[in-house]
């Protein structure tokens, strides 16, 4: 083993000292004879020491001893001691007691042999072992007077060699992280939690991070264990953006031919069944009714026009029932109903006319008479010298129950080229021209059009009481929706519990997977805010898709175009959710088509209005929007504009 130079010399010096020892003792005896027992001169002292440095050191001090104790001849013991100590420069010891191993007397000098860790002439200077190669320590070197020691950083312990360090595995202690996962790290450890949770060192547990406090969402934020979801005001036409935090407009992804014809009159605008047009004709000259117009519809039932006086006098109503023209008339209190002619709800234009002749009424379709009814009286009724006639289009001026035979007055139909009493009609034309809601779509197909701005609702019952009385009633919700969407987000079908302001069930289009936070076009089936099943759909392809939903005790399925959707809940969760749904179904619920009422955005996965074509079948019964308890006036019940042809 090689030692540093200084240490080597320190190691060797004691050996040298031992070699001089015999010589030193002889010198001491010689000094006794020459200068203690006798008075010696400098030259005699030189003979004792045999060198000048020691002599030069000794002689002045020798004279001091004489001065102090008297000459040798006085035989003062103090003198002998004084002189005997002079040649030993280590007496008194000039070296630092703590740092010196030995003091070596030299010729007029001395040498302090230092202990390990000390240095300097007097061995009073601490050697900083840490300054060179960290004192051989792997991590921390602690210098201290005459020594040093190694130590380790927190999380490490000193090895048996006193110099190297080894990592402490804190995770070996099961209590290190409490409920959290423990991960050992070099010199440390980390308590890990799942995403969305943060470690609480006080509780030694993972606690949910409330991301909503961080203001991550643009609109509504809902915190959940380990996660959060942002919601946008769907009813306001907004949906989540790509970043799943901000909101953006729900824009049509399929262009529909929604252009309107300014020369047409839409009859289905007023859901209340009240007329879209009310005209009053007054004449001094007795006049007969003549009405002619072009008409187009897919609707099987509704009122085209009313002409006459008040409900108890004389009037006629031209209507559609089962797709055929029906004429209801009341003359002087006597009512009749006549139906004849071809099915005309085929969606193509045809010319219809009503003409009052001397003793009969003639109804024509495309100039062919389909009805000729004998009547006794005139529709224009005299009053205070003037003849009066009220004419209403698309409804009647009294309640439909007061008709000869009740009928649903709502008619999704279109009129053009109308002519009332052979007169030019600038009034209606001017009104229609400035009011697009009074105009019809230029082109329509079968179906119902939801414009993305409203809904319809029905009061339907989903509980079924079995024939054998006394047994528990069962429930069933089966929905078949034929859809041709124009936008990627919107409620197709939903149940709403008004008393609880909850959404027990919803089927909707959505463009993201909320838990995976992934943009994807899906159909979602949900009970309240919990998604039960999801299924991918090519929503913006302009094609018709069939969405089928079936829920009954113990099962829930979602299918899109015959392919079954993915369940999003466990079997136990499904049962719990279906139990919630059943509880709702036992109370009054309303059935919504195309949207939801003003509910909190967190009530259901989607709250936006549906935009596009859709027909709904609920529990094997086709829903007729004319039969709804309420329908937004912009929803067309029996017609839908086609998808715009792709630009060449």
């Amino acid at each position: 083993a090689l030692l540093p130079a200084r240490e080597a010399t320190q190691f060797l010096r004691p050996r040298q000292r031992r070699a001089f020892q015999v010589f030193e003792e002889a010198k001491q005896g010689h000094l006794e004879r020459e200068c203690v027992e006798e008075l010696c001169s400098r030259e005699e002292a030189r003979e004792v020491f045999e060198n000048d440095p020691e002599t030069d050191y000794f002689y002045p001090r020798y004279l001091d001893c004489i001065n102090k104790y008297g000459s040798p001849y006085t035989k003062n013991s103090g003198f002998a001691t004084c002189v005997q100590n002079l040649p030993d420069q280590c007496t008194p010891n000039p070296c630092d007691r703590k740092g010196t191993q030995a003091c070596q007397d030299l010729m007029g000098n001395f040498f302090c042999l230092c202990k390990a860790g000390w240095g300097g002439r007097l061995c009073d200077k601490d050697v900083n072992e840490c300054s060179q190669e960290n004192g051989g320590c792997l991590q921390i070197c602690h210098n201290k007077p005459g020594s040093f020691h190694c130590s380790c950083h927190s999380g490490f312990e000193l090895s048996s060699d006193g110099r190297t360090c080894q990592d402490i595995d804190e995770c070996a202690d099961s209590e290190a992280c409490g409920e959290a996962r423990c991960k050992n790290l070099p010199g440390s450890y980390s308590c890990l939690c799942d995403e969305g949770f943060a470690y609480s060192s006080q509780e030694k547990a993972c606690r949910d991070v409330d991301e909503c406090l961080q203001g991550r969402c643009e609109q509504v934020c809902v915190n959940s264990p380990g996660s959060y979801t942002c919601h946008c005001d769907g009813r306001g036409g907004l949906k989540l953006s790509q970043d799943m935090d901000t909101c953006e407009d729900i824009l049509p992804c399929v262009p529909f031919s929604v252009a309107k014809s300014v020369k047409s009159l839409y009859l289905g605008r007023m859901f209340s069944g009240t007329p879209v047009i009310r005209l009053r004709f007054k004449r001094l000259q007795p006049t007969r009714l003549v009405a002619e117009f072009d008409f187009r519809t897919f609707d099987p039932e509704g009122i085209l026009l009313f002409a006459g006086g008040h409900q108890d006098s004389t009037w006629i109503v031209l209507a559609l029932r089962a797709g055929r023209l029906e004429l209801q008339l009341r003359y002087n209190g006597v009512g009749r109903v006549t139906s004849s002619g071809p099915v005309i709800n085929h969606g193509m234009w045809q010319t219809i006319s009503v003409e009052e002749l001397a003793r009969n009424l003639v109804i024509k379709v495309n100039r062919d008479a389909v009805m000729k009814i004998a009547v006794a009286g005139d529709l224009f009724q005299p009053e205070r010298g003037l003849y009066h006639l009220n004419l209403t289009v698309g409804g009647i001026p009294f309640h439909e129950k007061d008709l000869v035979q009740p009928i649903n007055p709502r008619l999704d139909g279109c009129m053009r080229s109308w002519n009332w009493l052979n007169g030019e009609d600038t009034t209606i034309q001017e009104t229609v021209k400035v009011n697009t809601r009074m105009q019809c779509f230029s082109v329509t197909e079968r179906g119902s059009f939801y414009p993305g701005s409203g809904f319809a609702f029905y009061s339907l019952d989903y509980m079924r009481t079995p024939l054998d009385v006394g047994t528990e009633s069962t429930w069933e919700v089966e929905v078949v929706a034929h859809i041709r969407p124009a936008a990627d987000t919107g409620v197709l079908f939903a149940l709403w519990a008004p008393d609880l302001r909850a959404v027990p069930l919803s089927v909707a289009l959505v463009d993201y997977h909320s838990t995976k936070k992934l943009k994807k076009q899906l159909v979602v089936l949900a009970v309240e805010h919990t998604a039960l099943a999801l299924m991918e759909i090519k929503v913006c392809d302009g094609q018709e898709h069939v969405v089928t939903v079936s829920l009954r005790d113990g099962e829930a399925t979602l299918e899109v175009d015959g392919t079954r959707g993915q369940s999003e809940v466990s079997a136990a969760q499904l049962q719990e959710r279906l139990a919630v749904l059943e509880r709702h179904l036992r109370s009054p619920v309303l059935t919504f088509a195309g949207g939801l009422p003003d509910v909190p955005v967190t009530s259901a996965p989607v709250t936006a209005f549906y935009r596009g074509c859709m027909t709904l079948e609920v529990n094997r019964r086709l829903l007729d929007l004319d039969e709804a308890a309420y329908k937004h006036s912009d929803i067309t019940a029996h017609s839908c504009p086609p998808v715009e042809p792709a630009a060449a």
Epitope: K282, N422, G423
Partner: antibody, heavy 116, light 107 residues
Framework: QVHLVQSGSELKKPGASVKISCKAS????????MNWVRQAPGQGLEWMGW????????TYTEEFKGRFVFSLDTSVTTSYLQISTLKAEDTAVYFC?????????WGQGTLVTVSS | ETTLTQSPSSLSVSTGDRVTITCITS??????MNWYQQKPGKAPKLLIS???TLRPGVPSRFSGSGSGTDFTFTISSTQPEDFATYYC?????????FGQGTKVEIK
């Protein structure tokens, strides 16, 4: 387009007669009655009555019974107003107006001046 | 016979002013009131027909209100072309009767 065009101004002496015309176009003449309205200089409007264009039967208000006669020629879709034994107070503008219970379409008016 | 009392007989207004003309009938005529505008040397023009209905092409500054026996015709902000004489006409019963007229002049 409905048009009612009246004959030109007339200057007559008291005791004379005058017959003014109102030619209708742009609609079926017999579907609407024809009204006559008088407006004396600086005065308001007075309804004189009307004629049934189907039957030719006239109806006069009390004030205009006697010297005033409404007539028709359906072949030329024209209605006439004749005033006999003219008086100075007959000086007025006479308007024809199509019957719609109220008056939407008017002739431009014919000024009849009775002056000696 | 239903008589109509129209007031005022004349009024002077500035452009932009609101004008209100009333017509009171001697019998209840429901809402069978009509309002006409007449300019010198011209035939009257129908502005408002029965049921307080604004006729096609008539500016929306003109309006009619009332039913029964009390009727009001309003010009919300008079324009230079509105200076004329205005008449009410009842078409509830024969004989048809006009109001005496209201002349709206420039102040």
């Amino acid at each position: 387009q409905v048009h009612l065009v009246q004959s030109g101004s007339e200057l007559k002496k008291p005791g004379a007669s005058v017959k003014i015309s109102c030619k209708a176009s742009g609609y079926t003449f017999t579907n609407y009655g024809m009204n006559w309205v008088r407006q004396a200089p600086g005065q308001g409007l007075e309804w004189m009555g009307w004629i049934n264009t189907n039957t030719g039967e006239p109806t006069y208000t009390e004030e205009f019974k006697g010297r005033f006669v409404f007539s028709l020629d359906t072949s030329v879709t024209t209605s006439y107003l004749q005033i006999s034994t003219l008086k100075a107070e007959d000086t007025a503008v006479y308007f024809c107006a199509r019957d719609e219970g109220w008056f939407v379409y008017w002739g431009q008016g014919t000024l009849v001046t009775v002056s000696s | 016979e239903t008589t109509l009392t129209q007031s005022p007989s004349s009024l002077s207004v500035s452009t932009g002013d609101r004008v209100t003309i009333t017509c009171i009938t001697s019998t209840d005529i429901d809402d069978d009131m009509n309002w006409y505008q007449q300019k010198p040397g011209k035939a009257p023009k129908l502005l408002i027909s029965e049921g307080n209905t604004l006729r096609p092409g008539v500016p929306s500054r003109f309006s009619g209100s009332g039913s029964g026996t009390d009727f009001t015709f309003t010009i919300s902000s008079t324009q230079p072309e509105d200076f004329a004489t205005y008449y009410c006409l009842q078409t509830d019963s024969v004989p048809l009767t006009f109001g005496q007229g209201t002349k709206v002049e420039i102040k």
